[in-house]
Amino acid sequence: FKVATPYSLYVCPEGQNVTLTCRLLGPVDKGHDVTFYKTWYRSSRGEVQTCSERRPIRNLTFQDLHLHHGGHQAANTSHDLAQRHGLESASDHHGNFSITMRNLTLLDSGLYCCLVVEIRHHHSEHRVHGAMELQVQTGKDAPSNCVVYPSSSQESENITA
């Protein structure tokens, strides 16, 4: 399987909400012994590898933000801690999973990574990740809503979170 990031850049005004999205692609084994661990964290663009460093999102670690289920099943963060920090991660039946960040501030700007780990006994641990950039802007140059830039082309889309 692979992870796709529909958008590589999100440009948002301060105070707006944004939903960062990743998509699980390819054949997904739905056997009873296979589960998927999905999570989010902040990182930096490493010289060798993007997403190798794992930093918290609003003081919450990737352990606090994970989703755990089999294949393309729906799930969302179960505890209140994330929501108290204005965060919620969720997953649908189609392989999409996301993190929603509410009331953005300039401190939220940076590189965000989604991670998927396939857990299967007696097999290698299969890990894939996706990366996207969030730019939070303030002042007269800031957009009125979030503007997202697709990963595959330079065309932008306006979205209201």
């Epitope: 190798s52 352990q63 606090d64 755990h68 801690l81 890990r127």
Partner: antibody
């Protein structure tokens, strides 16, 4: 910051049983995947068992399969290891540790000593 | 299971010297290798994850490299608190396995 504290160790005769506990502080224990790891006196580290945050799946090392049972009670912020049919070679310090998929053992308890001897 | 072999078993060095520890896997573990430090009477502490990344709070004098089957942990200039046992550990396959450890002792 979550802290882990093991208990339940002690001296037991071969063939006997013991139940270890790992108490976690912090409200997010129910989100954490956990392992038990042991270390025989003066020896290296050996992974024993792993449990997901929801209690399934569960994995065991071949050396303990069929004798040890890992479980958890998220309401009590606790992890357990039920050890039956104990052998002399099970003598070790037993550690509980956070073990997230795609990550490492990044948070450990202080350990509890289990001695199997007649 | 994947066997990790660490060398040397013991490294006798003085503070300020450079320590180089090796870990070799019986088959490829990709970059899914970690290094831990353990002091007497204490639980291990995570130093390095994914073969080369320092864990939170680990000083820059610790560095690591490698992929596949050969890995190295380097302590550029030994501090008194660095004398301990160091373990490598792989998570590419079940079961998780550890090396037998390298003891870094004061010369």
């Amino acid at each position: 910051q979550v802290q882990l504290v093991e208990s339940g160790g002690g001296l037991v005769k071969p063939g006997g049983s013991l139940r270890l506990s790992c108490a976690a502080s912090g409200e997010t224990f129910s989100e954490y995947y956990m392992s038990w790891i042991r270390q025989a006196p003066g020896k290296g580290l050996e992974w024993v068992s792993w449990i997901s945050n929801s209690g399934e799946p569960i994995y065991y090392a071949d050396s303990v399969k069929g004798r040890f049972t890992i479980s958890r009670d998220n309401a009590k912020n606790s992890l357990y290891l039920q050890m039956n049919s104990l052998r002399a070679e099970d003598t070790a310090v037993y550690y509980c540790a956070r073990d997230e998929p795609g990550w490492e053992f990044d948070l450990w308890g202080r350990g509890t000593l289990v001695t199997v001897s007649s | 299971e994947i066997v990790l072999t660490q060398s040397p078993a013991t490294l006798s060095l003085s503070p300020g010297e450079r320590a180089t520890l090796s870990c070799r896997a019986s088959q490829s573990v990709s970059s899914y290798l970690a290094w831990y430090q353990q002091k007497p009477g204490q639980a291990p502490r995570l130093l390095i994850y994914d073969a080369s990344n320092r864990a939170t709070g680990i000083p820059a004098r610790f560095s690591a490299s490698g992929s596949g089957t050969d890995f190295t942990l380097t302590i550029s200039s030994l501090e008194p608190e660095d004398f301990a046992v160091y373990y490598c550990q792989q998570r590419n396959n079940w079961p998780r396995t550890f090396g037998q450890g390298t003891k870094v002792e004061i010369k």
